[in-house]
């Protein structure tokens, strides 16, 4: 991001107010919603990036069966509580006093309750399972140049490491990721699989959230890859807490 | 080319004020901010504070909150940096200075500096 | 206000000698570090910004690495004209601070 005040911008999030009054002149950038400053070099947090878009204008080739503790988003938006550092808050709560608590990446992860309900700590989503369906094409995709591909993706344009795209699953037509990240592998500076799998999920539907860049062409040896449906599955490192209500219905 | 050219060497008094200048070319001078530097003979760099020419926004150190006004006139594209109350201590080379272009907050394009004295 | 401490404050090397100096700040800056280098009577001279970015026009033998709160400046293989003082600068945060110099002499 550039000094020159015409130029103030933050590459990996439009939805910033930029202005060089930072220390020395510094472009700094500021998320809507939230006003918190944050750092351009890098992804934005889900959560952070939640508030702002509520507070705008309205190996093996088997696939993965998600475990019986995954949890989906159906939920959909809400207007998140973030913390200083831009995480999720572990309880939540909207404008009616209903509470919940959630994980790392704002995901229900309890039955909703009162203004008393505790939520001890936040805890952490350490494997996302990204399931897409990609469209009709002539014959199936090249499976390791898929793999290929997606891993250069994950690595260059949501700059997450390697070591945390552990697995690319292809059964024409569907595609399956596996993001694992560990507390203790996470180090200072490591792009969270969350927010990496928030950015992608939010490319697929065509709502770019970096700045000036063009959307998403996905690409396999020249052959656009189109998805036609996306689910995501979040598992956390405590399994989540439902009732046998929710459970069975 | 890019330059930023101070104005030249003050004596003062102890409790005085003085102005120094700093006239910039070759750039648009709203689009980037101007920092302030000083440097006592035989010294370290020290920041004094910072403006933004076109929103007016400025920043300075505790050290010299309520002694140091930094100004600017668009029209010249001149910055200025008044200190007043001046001391002994204040005898010091004041460098004034441009952020890069990156918006990274390091300072690429510096003046010549301009040396004031105080002494009584 | 975060400190900057450079380590050594005085160093002496040979034309040719590969030198390292490097800046500690007291909490973490991520990686809004900038390198000076500064000759006798004139203003600093930008090298480095961003911690690892070398400033336009600026030789390939300087190069900085580090993020958080600890920093180097490497001159591969010293020229005459790096006989300076270099200073560390952090941006992460007002106020705008420097370390207090490393002198680099001939030896």
């Known amino acids: 991001h550039t000094a020159a005040q015409d130029n103030c911008t933050c590459p990996t999030n439009k939805m910033t107010v930029c202005s060089p009054d930072g220390p020395g002149g510094r472009c700094q950038c500021r998320a809507l919603g939230s006003g918190m400053a944050v750092d351009c070099s890098t992804l934005t947090s889900k959560c952070l990036l939640l508030k702002a878009r509520m507070s705008a204008p309205k190996n093996a080739r088997t696939l993965v069966r998600p475990s019986e503790h995954a949890l989906v988003d159906n939920d959909g938006l809400y207007d998140p509580d973030c913390d200083p550092e831009g995480r999720f808050k572990a309880r939540q709560c909207n404008q009616t006093s209903v509470c919940w608590c959630v994980n790392s990446v704002g995901v229900r992860r309890t039955d909703k309750g009162d203004l008393s309900l505790r939520c001890d700590e936040l805890v952490r989503t350490h494997h996302i399972l990204i399931d897409l369906r990609h469209r009709p094409t002539a014959g199936a995709f090249n499976h390791s140049d898929l793999d290929a591909e997606l891993r250069r993706l994950f690595r260059e344009r949501y700059r997450l490491h390697p070591k945390f795209v552990a697995a690319v699953h292809y059964e024409q037509p569907t595609i399956q990721i596996e993001l694992r990240q560990n507390t203790s592998q996470k180090a200072a500076g490591d792009v969270d699989i969350g927010d990496a799998a928030y950015y992608f999920e939010r490319d697929i539907k065509g709502e770019s959230l970096f700045q000036g860049r063009g959307g998403l062409d996905l690409r396999v040896r020249g052959e656009p890859l189109q998805v036609e449906r996306t689910l995501i599955y979040y598992l956390d490192e405590i399994p989540p807490k439902f009732s046998m209500k929710r459970l069975t219905a | 080319q890019v330059q930023l050219v101070q104005s030249g060497a003050e004596v003062k008094k102890p409790g005085a004020s003085v102005k120094v200048s700093c006239k910039a070319s070759?750039?648009?001078?709203?689009?980037?901010?101007i920092n302030w530097v000083r440097q006592a003979t035989g010294r370290g760099l020290e920041w004094m504070g910072w403006?933004?020419?076109?929103?007016?926004?400025?920043g300075y150190a505790q050290k010299f909150q309520g002694r140091v006004t930094i100004t600017a006139d668009e029209s010249t594209s001149t910055a200025y940096m008044e200190l007043s109350s001046l001391r002994s201590e204040d005898t010091a080379v004041y460098y004034c200075?441009?952020?890069?272009?990156?918006?990274?907050?390091?300072?690429?394009?510096w003046g010549q500096g301009t040396m004031v004295t105080v002494s009584s | 206000d975060i400190q900057l401490t450079q380590s050594p404050s005085s160093v002496s090397a040979s034309v040719g000698d590969r030198v390292t100096i490097t800046c500690r700040a007291s909490?973490?800056?991520?990686?809004?570090l900038a390198w000076y280098r500064q000759k006798p009577g004139k203003a600093p001279k930008l090298l480095i910004y961003r911690a690892h970015s070398l400033q336009s026009g600026v030789p390939s033998r300087f190069s900085g690495s580090g993020s958080g709160t600890d920093f180097t400046l490497t001159i591969s293989s010293l020229q005459p004209e790096d006989f300076a003082t270099y200073y560390c600068q952090q941006a992460n945060s007002f106020p705008v601070t420097f370390g207090q110099g490393t002198r680099l002499e001939i030896k």
């Open positions: 200075a441009r952020p890069n272009t990156g918006g990274d907050g390091a300072f690429d394009i």
């Open positions: 909490q973490g800056i991520k990686s809004w």
């Open positions: 070759g750039y648009t001078f709203t689009n980037y901010g």
């Open positions: 403006m933004n020419p076109r929103s007016g926004n400025t």
